[in-house]
């Protein structure tokens, strides 16, 4: 768990406290909330970031239509239970013993139950659709330029392997970024698409998680790309298990950014 050794900080996670008391006398950065040591050479897991956040003093259809099994994060923030590696535990419970199952990005994928609820495994979210609406501009962005810039962003800022950015769709003013990563495709050391999507979401909101870096300044051929609305859909390797009542009254949670 190394970090910038000269001043012992965590470039990839400002929600940490760092001290020179790690193995071998190296700098060790602990995530707020959990106290788990994080690897500052890569993104911190979404579970640890959420825990830290909760502990902090607070026409030609080129666009993808999410499938009926797509999940959106309707429940908002909660203080999650993370496993020893910092991943979401399959079962989450609140203080009043209400429990539910989540996927690998921490989004609820079952109806809520009691302490007897079983979540046998952590189901992987293998497809993430990031749906953005940009502010009006003089003209539409060039699709290939936009595609290249967003791919560069995920590769350089979030260290996500290019093969996991499946597609970038554009139909002014809507941009869609598709991230795909099956269990079999994810090798040791690969950034998880769920973590990359969460860092991107926080960047878009002007809440960058990176230490000391300026906020996200997205430009396409010098033209600022300003996002006014994001909506993220999560698709799991195994479809979610909601009651029919829930499926027929599925309220999408929209993130508005101004």
């Amino acid at each position: 768990h190394t970090a910038a050794q000269d001043n012992c900080t965590c470039p990839t996670n400002k929600m940490t406290v760092c001290s020179p008391d790690g193995p071998g006398g190296r700098c060790q950065c602990r995530a707020l909330g959990s106290g788990m040591a994080v690897d500052c050479s890569t993104l911190t897991s979404k579970c640890l970031l959420l825990k830290a956040r909760m502990s902090a003093p607070k026409n030609a259809r080129t666009l993808v239509r999410p499938s009926e099994h797509a999940l959106v994060d309707n429940d908002g923030l909660y203080d999650p239970d993370c496993d020893p590696e910092g991943r979401f535990k399959a079962r989450q419970c609140n203080q009043t013993s209400v429990c539910w199952c989540v996927n690998s990005v921490g989004v609820r994928r079952t109806d809520k139950g009691d302490l007897s609820l079983r979540c046998d495994e952590l189901v992987r979210t293998h497809h993430i659709l990031i749906d953005l609406r940009h502010r009006p501009t003089a003209g539409a962005f060039n699709h290939s330029d936009l595609d290249a810039e967003l791919r560069r962003l995920f590769r350089e800022r979030y260290r996500l392997h290019p093969k996991f950015v499946a597609a970038v769709h554009y139909e002014q003013p809507t941009i869609q970024i598709e991230l795909r990563q099956n269990t079999s495709q994810k090798a040791a050391g690969d950034v998880d698409i769920g973590d990359a999507a969460y860092y991107f979401e926080r960047d878009i909101k002007g809440e960058s998680l990176f230490q000391g870096r300026g906020g996200l300044d997205l430009r396409v051929r010098g033209e600022p790309l300003q996002v006014e609305r994001t909506l993220i859909y999560y698709l799991d390797e195994i479809p979610p298990k909601f009651s029919m009542k829930r499926l027929t009254h599925h309220h999408h949670h929209h993130h508005h950014h101004h």
């Epitope: 001290s19 008391d21 790690g22 193995p23 707020l32 959990s34 106290g35 020893p84 590696e85």
Partner: antibody
Framework: QVQLVQSGAEVKKPGASVKVSCKAS????????IHWVRQAPGQGLEWIGT????????VYNQKFRDRATMTRDRSISTAYIELSRLRSDDTAVYYC????????WGQGTTVTVSS | EIVLTQSPATLSLSPGERATLSCRAS??????IHWFQQKPGGAPRLLIK???ESISGIPSRFSGSGSGTDFTLTISSLEPEDFAVYYC?????????FGQGTKLEIK
């Protein structure tokens, strides 16, 4: 050389509060966690919590969250723990220790709670 | 919270013998375990950090091993001053916890 020197023994009545100090020297006080640990007579070691002196970020063992307060004064390289609403079972030796692996310890402060 | 279980509770050996003390964690904690010796009336003293890293000033007869959930402190040849209580402690995540201790006594 690194040293942690604690304040002297205290005798308190139930319901009172006690504040123990831990003065650090021989290293950069702000860069290492200070932990508080207690040991009741004949018992094992119990972690109360920790504070990071640089920014005063503190973490408490759930058991002590409502009664313990950890603070620090960077100007005199001293950490403090205050325990309120004392009970007889708070009678113990209270230690401060440095870093995640507790490489240096204070000499201990005996707190006796008795009516 | 992570529970550390030490065994045996008491270990009776003679000077010159080899002592093997065990500490088991309730979940995977990597190598975030540290070992302490405590004598009556004194503060604990760090012997080993991060499962196997030696500490300056600690005799080489003290060594540590293990990772994940099972950890061992070994004293290769007991000296009379080694008879004391030994604790393991983890620093994987908050709250930090200690094992209940192993008392090493003279047989």
């Amino acid at each position: 050389q690194v040293q942690l020197v604690q304040s002297g023994a205290e005798v308190k009545k139930p319901g009172a509060s006690v504040k123990v100090s831990c003065k650090a020297s021989g290293y950069s006080f702000t860069t290492h966690w200070i932990h508080w640990v207690r040991q009741a007579p004949g018992q094992g070691l119990e972690w109360i919590g920790t504070i990071f002196p640089s920014n005063a970020y503190a973490v408490y063992n759930q058991k002590f969250r409502d009664r313990a307060t950890m603070t620090r004064d960077r100007s005199i390289s001293t950490a403090y723990i205050e325990l309120s609403r004392l009970r007889s079972d708070d009678t113990a030796v209270y230690y401060c220790a440095r870093a995640s692996y507790f490489d240096y310890w204070g000499q201990g402060t005996t707190v006796t709670v008795s009516s | 919270e992570i529970v550390l279980t030490q065994s045996p509770a008491t270990l009776s050996l003679s000077p010159g013998e080899r002592a093997t003390l065990s500490c088991r964690a309730s979940q995977n904690i990597g190598t975030s375990i540290h070992w302490f010796q405590q004598k009556p009336g004194g503060a604990p003293r760090l012997l080993i950090k991060y499962a196997s890293e030696s500490i300056s000033g600690i005799p080489s007869r003290f060594s540590g091993s293990g990772s994940g959930t099972d950890f061992t402190l070994t004293i290769s040849s007991l000296e009379p001053e080694d008879f004391a209580v030994y604790y393991c402690q983890h620093s994987h995540s908050w709250p930090f916890t200690f094992g209940q201790g192993t008392k090493l006594e003279i047989k």
